[in-house]
């Protein structure tokens, strides 16, 4: 008789997810040579202690912070670009602007990446069937605490100017509701934060409207003055010339906006 | 078969400076990390300092940080150490070593020994 | 007082097997590699274990290393009068930015 099993309304786990992560880490120490000595091993061991026989409407914080003793990882803190809604354009800005990073591309960030992972209470086994969805089941589930584990210590070790990339195609440019706004927003240090840059990022070609004018921007606005952290915002109306100019900053049509 | 050779150790005066160099041969040596580990008279080993290959980063012991100065020329298969404001503790046998690709020290040169006192 | 802890001396006689623990932390040892090194005085350390538990060629199976948590260790089968030398466990200190040795620990070969 097969043994009952919780019926999540989210995906399971991604199929050959151990495998995943240490493939991922082990690709990621090749390519960062400055991370050569990490024991992928003992990353993946606490990676699963954080959520393996433990219910995946339950976890904490506190279950990942011995995973989260590896995220000392020195990345220069006033390189720092945060995202929302718009991954692929600020991931393919940091391939092209190398001393720049995403969360995306510290090794924690590299490993969980676009998986999704539960276990299941008092077993062992990884839940391959379906995850708890954050809306439909709950918040504390193992990838949604993860994210805002890690988005928090990212925005809490930022320094001088931040950069933030926004959709501005999205009809909340800024959404309270997203991981920028429910969490780096908060855990930017205005001791160490001096402004935060927005870059709104068209969707249009004939878009000529100041995105910045927008009244979600304004609150993000709101937000960081009250905490004491400069604002600035730009547009970027065509983000193919923008990334174009990344790459080949001499070329002669680079200095007129973008 | 690879080669670390040391020099420019000495006997020097508290808050004097010395230079250490090391000449490699026999791998491609702007492949490498680099590192330099001493051993003090009776004591054990102690990592001193670290180069990265391509646009060098540098890494160090809080002991010697803002004295000491590890540098490499990739042109000359040469790592240096450019040690100011000695201390009587810094006096050690230092050894070149190159980092293998887990972050080992694979290979080791002979030492050269660094005395201060006055 | 080194940040990596190891016995000061371990003995044996020939043809025994002695083991050397080393014990660190999560910043340490628990997340990256430990290296084993073999030093003789008046001659260069030699490496002897990588990656925990990985010898490099011309190593003597003999040597073996391990890895649990935030400690390791080296055993020495079948204990010869050539090892007798000092030994050290290393790792990388996420902490301190840089390696960190043991203390180092003496093995004696007996009769």
């Known amino acids: 008789v097969p043994r009952w099993r919780q019926q999540w309304s989210g995906p399971g786990t991604t199929k050959r997810f151990p495998e995943t992560v240490l493939a991922r880490c082990v690709k990621y120490t090749e390519i960062h040579p400055e991370m050569r000595h990490v024991d992928c091993q003992s990353v993946w061991d606490a990676f699963k202690g954080a959520f393996i026989s433990k219910h995946p409407c339950n976890i904490t914080e506190e279950d990942y912070q011995p995973l989260m003793k590896l995220g000392t990882q020195t990345v220069p803190c006033n390189k720092i670009l945060l995202w929302s809604r718009i991954k692929d354009l600020a991931h393919q800005f940091t391939q092209v602007q190398r001393d720049m990073f995403t969360l995306e591309d510290t090794l924690l960030g590299y490993l969980a990446d676009d998986l999704t992972w539960c276990g299941e209470f008092n077993t062992s086994k990884i839940n391959y069937q379906s995850c708890p969805d954050w809306r439909k089941d709950c918040s504390n589930n193992p990838v949604s605490v993860f994210w805002k584990t890690v988005s928090r210590r990212f925005a809490e070790a930022a320094c001088d100017v931040v950069h933030v990339m926004l959709n501005g195609s999205r009809s909340k440019i800024f959404d309270k509701n997203s991981t920028f706004g429910s969490v780096e927003v908060h855990n930017l240090q205005p001791e160490k934060v001096q402004t935060l840059e927005a870059w709104v990022i068209h969707g249009g070609r004939e878009d000529s409207r100041d995105l910045c004018q927008d009244p979600t921007i304004k609150e993000l606005e709101s937000i960081i003055s009250k905490r004491n952290i400069q604002f600035s915002c730009k547009n970027i109306y065509r983000p193919d010339k923008f990334l174009q100019c990344v790459k080949n900053p001499e070329d002669s049509s680079c200095t007129s906006e973008i | 078969q690879v080669q670390l050779v040391e020099s420019g150790g000495g006997l020097v005066k508290p808050g004097g400076s010395l230079r250490l160099s090391c000449a490699a041969s026999?791998?491609?040596?702007?492949?490498?990390?680099m590192s330099w580990i001493r051993q003090a008279p009776g004591k054990g080993l102690e990592w001193v300092a670290s180069?990265?290959?391509?646009?060098?980063?540098?890494y160090y012991a809080d002991s010697v940080r803002g004295r000491f100065t590890i540098s490499r020329d990739n042109a000359k298969n040469s790592l240096y150490l450019q040690m100011n404001s000695l201390r009587a503790e810094d006096t050690a046998v230092y050894y070149c070593?190159?980092?293998?690709?887990?972050?080992?020290?694979?290979?080791w040169g002979q030492g050269t020994l660094v005395t201060v006192s006055s | 007082q080194s940040v990596l802890t190891q016995p000061p001396s371990a003995s044996g006689t020939s043809g025994q097997r002695v083991t050397i623990s080393c014990s660190g932390s999560?910043?340490?040892?628990?997340?990256?590699?430990v290296y084993w090194y073999q030093h003789l005085p008046g001659t260069a350390p030699k490496l002897l274990i990588y990656?925990?538990?990985q010898r490099p060629s011309g190593v003597p199976d003999r040597f073996s290393g391990s890895k649990s948590g935030n400690s390791a260790s080296l055993a020495i089968s079948g204990l010869r009068s050539e090892d007798e030398a000092d030994y050290y466990c290393?790792?990388?200190?996420?902490?301190?930015?840089?390696?960190?040795f043991g203390s180092g620990t003496k093995v004696t070969v007996l009769g």
């Open positions: 070593a190159r980092e293998g690709w887990s972050g080992e020290f694979t290979d």
């Open positions: 026999g791998f491609t040596f702007s492949d490498d990390y």
């Open positions: 180069v990265s290959n391509g646009r060098p980063t540098t």
């Open positions: 999560s910043s340490n040892i628990g997340f990256h590699f």
């Open positions: 990656k925990n538990n």
């Open positions: 290393a790792a990388w200190d996420d902490s301190l930015s840089g390696y960190v």
